[in-house]
Each structure stands twice: as structure tokens, then as C-alpha cells.
Interface confidence: low
């Protein structure tokens, strides 16, 4: 598995990561850490593992965290009750 760097699918990344769109170059996907407490997230992000190609630049939140709305268009990873 690729621990970091370019990828195409989640299976090419290490544990605790997903293959997300680069925030710098949209045509490139890179192995990205899953969301930690307080990280920005997107509520429609696919869960790991996803066997297709992601369209988001964020990964889902780590296990035990949920992607929750904090304002009209902002979501962050918060502890699941």
C-alpha cells in the first residue's frame, strides 16, 4: 500500500487514510488522512473503503467521530455520542 502520495483508490492507501482529490491539483488524487476531531469534512463523503474514485478532497471522519454541521455550510468531525 502507498502510505502517502498519488493514488487512484482507497486500497492503495495505508490504514486511516483514503484516496481523496488533492486540494492543490484537482486532477490528482492523494492518500489523505481520515478526519480527526475538529477537522473539516463533507457529510456526503464516501466511507472507507470506497472502491471507486473519490470526488471530495476530504476523507470521512475517523471511527468514533461523525461529520456534523456547525454552521450553514460548515461541517467538522465531532465525537459521536
Amino acid at each position: 500500500a502507498v502510505i502517502t502520495g498519488a493514488c487512484d483508490k482507497d486500497s492503495q492507501c495505508g490504514g486511516g487514510m483514503c484516496c481523496a482529490v488533492s486540494i492543490w491539483v484537482k486532477s490528482i488524487r492523494i492518500c489523505t488522512p481520515m478526519g480527526k476531531l475538529g477537522d473539516s469534512c463533507h457529510p456526503l463523503t464516501r466511507k472507507v473503503p470506497f472502491f471507486g474514485r473519490r470526488m471530495h478532497h476530504t476523507c470521512p471522519c475517523l471511527p468514533g467521530l461523525a461529520c456534523l454541521r456547525t454552521s450553514f455550510n460548515r461541517f467538522i468531525c465531532l465525537a459521536q455520542k
Partner: antibody
Framework: EVQLVQSGAEVKKPGASVKVSCKAS????????MHWVRQAPGQGLEWIGY????????TYNQKFKGRVTITVDKSTSTAYLELSSLRSEDTAVYYC??????????????WGQGTLVTVSS | DIVMTQSPDSLAVSLGERATINCKAS??????????MNWYQQKPGQPPKLLIY???NLESGVPDRFSGSGSGTDFTLTISSLQAEDVAVYYC?????????FGQGTKVEIK
């Protein structure tokens, strides 16, 4: 057993405000969002908005922006809908409905019994 | 806003026969390969009841004679063998973007 119990029927004059309550029980209140939906007599369903019971963040149907306020009181596990500047077209049954937490599908799995709000001069 | 249009407005079906309700969205309600469409049943004097979420997922406790299908803009709720207790109004709802919007409803009756 999950239950959503709403306040009783209201009769209001045009221009007034109404506040409907929805007391939740049988689940962890802050783990679920709460939606409000209304239904005019003999008509279909209209989504008003929803609130995160966890942090109070709201999303409203733009149609009601400026007239609607959704709040929660975590200490009593109660959600509130306040609608101001009432007009006759606001006469409807107002429902609270819990979001089922089905991933990104905002599906309303438990509903209150409804509160009839009548706006009449 | 996404406009949801159901057809037919009403439907009379014999007991044990299949009932099919269609719902068309004014734009796609798909996202990342999933379809953000729910179906509800409402009986007179009662609040709506969730039947299907995310186009094809049966809500817990709902009989398996109910099923949902479709993607993009076209969706279907099917009752494979209509029972007397299925007489109700059925609503589709898109939840792909807010405001979440409902169809106008389809009334299902016994023929």
C-alpha cells in the same frame, strides 16, 4: 420507545407569532437532528427546516427565512418552532420529525402527532 | 428548488395486485452514485411514516412488499401485493439539496 409529543392546537390572528413545542423521549436527544414539516388542510407536505440538537445549527427553507426560528432546549429534550408574521396561508398542521441518521439521506423516521395552527381574523 | 412530480395523482388497485407510483425530479437527485430520495406513507389523521430511504432502502419494520427503485430524476415506489392497510397517500421527497421538497402525493385506494 421513541416518542415526539407536540403542544396543543393554536388559534392566532394575522400578524401574530406562534411557538410550537416538540418534546422528545426514548432516545439520546443530541444525537439526532430535528426537522419541522407542515401540511395545509387537504394539501401536501412542506419542509420548513431542521436543527442539530447537538449544537443548535439550523438550516431553513428560504421560503420561511426571516419568519421562522427553530431552537432546542437540551435540558428538556425539546425542540421549538416559532413562526412570526402569520398569515392565513400559514394555517396548517405542523409536525416535528426526527432525522433517522441514515448517512446522507435525511430521512424522517419518527414524527410528532402534529399541531394544528389556525390563522384567522 | 427541485420540483417533485408524482404520477398518477390517484390509483385504484385490487387487493393482492401490484401498485406502482412514479416520481420525477426536475433535476438529478443523485450524488456520488447514490440517489437521495425517500418515500413516505400517510394515512388519514396520522403523521407520515417513512417507508424507503435513499431510493431503495427499506425502513426497519416496513413490510417487504414495499420497494423503491430508480436513479437520477426518475423513481418508483412499488407495492407488490396491495393489502387493505396500504390505503393511504404516498409522498416522495428529495434530500439531495435544501430545501428538501416533496411530491404532491398519490392516493392509493382499493378497486
Amino acid at each position: 420507545e421513541v416518542q415526539l409529543v407536540q403542544s396543543g392546537a393554536e388559534v392566532k390572528k394575522p400578524g401574530a407569532s406562534v411557538k410550537v413545542s416538540c418534546k422528545a423521549s426514548g432516545y439520546s436527544f443530541t444525537d439526532y437532528d430535528m426537522h419541522w414539516v407542515r401540511q395545509a388542510p387537504g394539501q401536501g407536505l412542506e419542509w420548513i427546516g431542521y436543527i442539530s440538537a447537538y449544537n443548535g445549527a439550523t438550516t431553513y427553507n428560504q421560503k420561511f427565512k426571516g419568519r421562522v426560528t427553530i431552537t432546542v432546549d437540551k435540558s428538556t429534550s425539546t425542540a421549538y418552532l416559532e413562526l412570526s408574521s402569520l398569515r392565513s396561508e400559514d394555517t396548517a398542521v405542523y409536525y416535528c420529525a426526527r432525522d433517522g441518521n441514515y448517512g446522507e439521506a435525511y430521512a424522517m423516521d419518527y414524527w410528532g402527532q402534529g399541531t394544528l395552527v389556525t390563522v384567522s381574523s | 428548488d427541485i420540483v417533485m412530480t408524482q404520477s398518477p395523482d390517484s390509483l385504484a388497485v385490487s387487493l393482492g395486485e401490484r401498485a406502482t407510483i412514479n416520481c420525477k425530479a426536475s433535476q438529478s437527485v443523485d450524488y456520488d452514485g447514490d440517489s437521495y430520495m425517500n418515500w413516505y406513507q400517510q394515512k388519514p389523521g396520522q403523521p407520515p411514516k417513512l417507508l424507503i430511504y435513499a431510493a431503495s432502502n427499506l425502513e426497519s419494520g416496513v413490510p417487504d412488499r414495499f420497494s423503491g427503485s430508480g436513479s437520477g430524476t426518475d423513481f418508483t415506489l412499488t407495492i407488490s401485493s396491495l393489502q387493505a392497510e396500504d390505503v393511504a397517500v404516498y409522498y416522495c421527497q428529495q434530500i439531495n439539496e435544501d430545501p428538501f421538497t416533496f411530491g404532491q402525493g398519490t392516493k392509493v385506494e382499493i378497486k
